[in-house]
């Protein structure tokens, strides 16, 4: 089979063979090479020369195969917007940001632009675990049977009820979704004022 055309090459139907790495240049009606990530177009192509690419300067980047004549400026993660850096900007990738702990992304435009504090989950509930931390606000779900959570918190997890017998104690009061089991020494009666607490 014949070798494929190498840019620049004529394109009467205005489409290029490799859409990722080539682009149609309408003035010359040809397909030219895009510049690889981390570079930009320093000289445009013509019918007798392909695109000339140059490396992005420090503190700038281009993430994709492109025909941009400039590189994008690296931007820091804005702490005022609740963002923190997880990976620095390189010539091939913008600064990677995420919401600070205890926050979720409240505004999304291709990437997170603004984070807000996660809502508290009331006692007896916990935040449903998400695939990606910081992606959305808390969705509080009841503690499953045998577990409790006794604070208003965005991050507290339901804990298993204490098993009194594991500590050589006996149950004085059963646990609820909002409170732990109350245990007592098997030899001692539970004083009224100690109701709802665990005796050791």
């Amino acid at each position: 089979s014949q070798p494929q055309a190498v840019p620049p090459y004529a394109s009467e139907n205005q489409t290029c063979r490799d859409q990722e790495k080539e682009y149609y240049e309408p003035q010359h009606r040809i397909c030219c090479s895009r510049c690889p990530p981390g570079t930009y177009v320093s000289a445009k192509c013509s019918r007798i020369r392909d695109t000339v690419c140059a490396t992005c300067a420090e503190n700038s980047y281009n993430e994709h195969w492109n025909y941009l004549t400039i590189c994008q400026l690296c931007r820091p993660c804005d702490p005022v917007m609740g963002l923190e850096e997880i990976a620095p900007c390189t010539s091939k990738r913008k600064t990677q940001c995420r919401c600070q702990p205890g926050m979720f992304c409240a505004a999304w435009a291709l990437e997170c632009t603004h984070c807000e504090l996660l809502s508290d989950c009331p006692p007896g509930t916990e935040a449903e675990l998400k695939d990606e931390v910081g992606k959305g606000n808390n969705h509080c779900v009841p503690c499953k049977a045998g577990h409790f959570q006794n604070t208003s918190s965005p991050s507290a997890r339901c804990q298993p009820h204490t098993r009194c017998e594991n500590q050589g104690l006996v149950e004085a009061a059963p646990g609820t979704a909002q409170s732990d089991t109350t245990c007592k020494n098997p030899l001692e009666p539970l004083p009224p004022e100690m109701s709802g607490t665990m005796l050791m």
Partner: antibody, heavy 123, light 110 residues
Framework: QVQLVESGGGVVQPGRSLRLSCAAS????????MHWVRQAPGKGLEWVTT????????YYADSVKGRFTISRDNSKNTLFLQMNSLRAEDTAVYYC????????????????WGQGTAVTVSS | QSVLTQPPSVSAAPGQKVTISCSGS????????VSWYQQLPGTVPKLLIY???KRPSGIPDRFSGSKSGTSVTLGITGLQTGDEADYYC???????????FGGGTKLTVL
């Protein structure tokens, strides 16, 4: 109006040198790749050399490589061809066309040829 | 020996149609646009067809161009005595990094 005027031709002995000029007007010379094309008496068109718009790259036909040098002065809108070690087979009319439909795709009256300048190499 | 191959001559009677072929390879005609030039006797070449098949303003529609693979064809209908000239195809050769021309075709109107 686009115009190209070649000059500098004449009769020269084999082994001698000659410098051709091409004065451009009516278009933005510095935006265009330029060329020299020659036509020997009774023969067809023969491409000689090409220079990029900014002078950064040059191409030569095998028949003139090492003997001819193309250059340009964009501030003066002028193209040059320095011809050294001339031979009888270099006898021709020399043109400096824009050939813009071939090299850039511009065609709005831009593929223009001058009247040419005659070079005769004879002892 | 030209990189692009044209017949040395063609002829036809006035009012007739004639075609001039120009064949090359993938690195020139195959990948690039072809221009046709007309050189009337004693004059300089003039652009006749560009981008394989387009006519500059002022060129009558009796002149046409087409491309198929690594060959192009110039067609002239309604031949006139004033069409007697040399016709050249030209393009860029990506492998040679050179402008390449056909050897030229002399058109005679009988």
């Amino acid at each position: 109006q686009v115009q190209l005027v070649e000059s500098g031709g004449g009769v020269v002995q084999p082994g001698r040198s000659l410098r051709l000029s091409c004065a451009a007007s009516g278009f933005t010379f510095s935006n265009y790749d330029m060329h020299w094309v020659r036509q020997a008496p009774g023969k067809g068109l023969e491409w000689v050399t090409t220079i990029w718009y900014d002078g950064s790259n040059k191409y030569y036909a095998d028949s003139v490589k090492g003997r001819f040098t193309i250059s340009r002065d964009n501030s003066k809108n002028t193209l040059f061809l320095q011809m050294n070690s001339l031979r009888a087979e270099d006898t021709a009319v020399y043109y400096c066309p824009t050939l813009s439909t071939v090299t850039t795709g511009d065609y709005y009256g831009m593929d223009v040829w001058g009247q040419g300048t005659a070079v005769t190499v004879s002892s | 020996q030209s990189v692009l191959t044209q017949p040395p001559s063609v002829s036809a009677a006035p009012g007739q149609k004639v075609t001039i072929s120009c064949s090359g390879s993938r690195s020139n005609i195959g990948n690039n646009y072809v221009s046709w030039y007309q050189q009337l006797p004693g004059t300089v070449p003039k652009l006749l067809i560009y981008d394989n098949s387009k006519r500059p303003s002022g060129i009558p529609d009796r002149f046409s161009g087409s491309k198929s693979g690594t060959s192009v064809t110039l067609g002239i209908t309604g031949l006139q005595t004033g069409d007697e000239a040399d016709y050249y195809c030209g393009t860029w050769d990506s492998s040679l990094s050179a402008v390449v021309f056909g050897g030229g075709t002399k058109l005679t109107v009988l």
